[in-house]
Interface confidence: low
Amino acid sequence: MAPFASLASGILLLLSLIASSKACSCAPTHPQTAFCNSDLVIRAKFMGSPEIIETTLYQRYEIKMTKMLKGFDAVGNATGFRFAYTPAMESLCGYVHKSQNRSEEFLIAGRLRNGNLHITACSFLVPWHNLSPAQQKAFVKTYSAGCGVCTVFPCSAIPCKLESDSHCLWTDQILMGSEKGYQSDHFACLPRNPDLCTWQYLGVSMTRSLPLAKAEA
């Protein structure tokens, strides 16, 4: 175990050095965490290049919302959002949309400020078709069950341990070398009973737990 721990620690140190050399470095985020921490989660299409808002630190993208997955309470009966606002500078975590395909649908998890949708380079924002079927289902239905109750706890260095029974250890970075791993793609951290959260499989059956994913506290 020691050689693996040493190797993993070395890799993580290197990654942290690379990340810290950039002005805007984003912590890896499990999709469930992104869902729960966002005011708004929508599916939308980007309609063109960003428009700089004169004399401000913001720019905005025109979007066409196709579906709202979270935020009904915050928005009330608003019909949708025409713009996504982001800092105008990449060094302030401004989001840069690279796809030119206006018909491509994106999942956007953002924050609501002043009645506007705000996104940054750290926002969970991915093409909808890039999500696994299990993730798509979870964004529509399942992740919400864990919000405010369960916490995805990132394991970024070995050893790591749970701090609470409401936490689920997220080990994708250690075991898979990426935040886009098996737990991200196929599992959600959900309440098993009022005092305990566990990883639950996002497949047909919601009862199968991820083996060894929850270590002793």
Epitope: S21, K22, A23, L57, M89, S91, C93, R113, N114
Partner: antibody, heavy 118, light 106 residues
Framework: QVQLVESGGGLVQPGGSLRLSCAAS????????MSWVRQAPGKGLEWVSA????????YYADSVKGRFTISRDNSKNTLYLQMNSLRAEDTAVYYC???????????WGQGTLVTVSS | DIELTQPPSVSVAPGQTARISCSGD??????ASWYQQKPGQAPVLVIY???DRPSGIPERFSGSNSGNTATLTISGTQAEDEADYYC?????????FGGGTKLTVL
């Protein structure tokens, strides 16, 4: 570690000019937006100007627009503030500060005093 | 432009909780940051994005922001927390600082 050191302050007559510099070290300067904030003696903080990491975008408070110019030389890791048509109300300690992620100013220099007086 | 109003002074006994308010029109719809400044020193960022704490800032510092008021809370206030505190927010017209609050630890 991150260090910001301002210089160029001093006594200048009303209508005069001054150029402040801020030498940065300990981080990848060109990746960070930077800002100038001032504080008049015994008063609070006032945001003055900001510039993007590349230097391509600049922003100014209304009180200095048209008189002050912010710039940077990424090859020298240095931020500048060119101040023209100075007024008595520009008297202040001028701080150079770095933007962290989003809009918090996470590192500040110790400041340089600019006194505008006849 | 948004105007931010802070009380000029707040006093607290050591070990007690200090709360410093910052009010502005619909401030809760914007992000607020807080800075600590001790005499003769540069400001230090203690809270950003309403409630996030930079690394190195003690856990006793916390922030909240809703409605028209952002609040900096210092739990278990210590003598070393005596300083001036400034709130800062931004509208689409850049940054605005509050007038500052002098925190006195009795």
């Amino acid at each position: 570690q991150v260090q910001l050191v301002e210089s160029g302050g001093g006594l200048v007559q009303p209508g005069g000019s001054l150029r402040l510099s801020c030498a940065a070290s300990g981080f990848t300067f060109s990746s960070y937006a930077m800002s100038w904030v001032r504080q008049a003696p015994g008063k609070g903080l006032e945001w003055v100007s900001a510039i993007s990491g590349s230097g391509g975008s600049t922003y100014y408070a209304d009180s200095v627009k048209g008189r002050f110019t912010i710039s940077r030389d990424n090859s020298k890791n240095t931020l500048y503030l060119q101040m023209n048509s100075l007024r008595a109300e520009d008297t202040a300690v001028y701080y150079c500060a770095r933007y962290g992620a989003y809009f918090g100013l996470d590192y500040w220099g110790q400041g340089t005093l600019v006194t505008v007086s006849s | 432009d948004i105007e931010l109003t802070q009380p000029p002074s707040v006093s607290v006994a050591p070990g007690q909780t200090a709360r410093i308010s910052c009010s502005g029109d619909a401030l809760g719809d914007k992000y607020a940051s807080w800075y600590q400044q001790k005499p003769g020193q540069a400001p230090v960022l203690v809270i950003y994005d309403d409630s996030d704490r930079p690394s190195g800032i003690p856990e006793r510092f916390s922030g909240s922001n809703s409605g028209n008021t952002a609040t900096l809370t210092i739990s278990g206030t210590q003598a070393e927390d005596e300083a001036d505190y400034y709130c800062q927010s931004y509208d689409f017209n850049f940054h605005v600082f509050g007038g500052g609050t002098k925190l006195t630890v009795l």
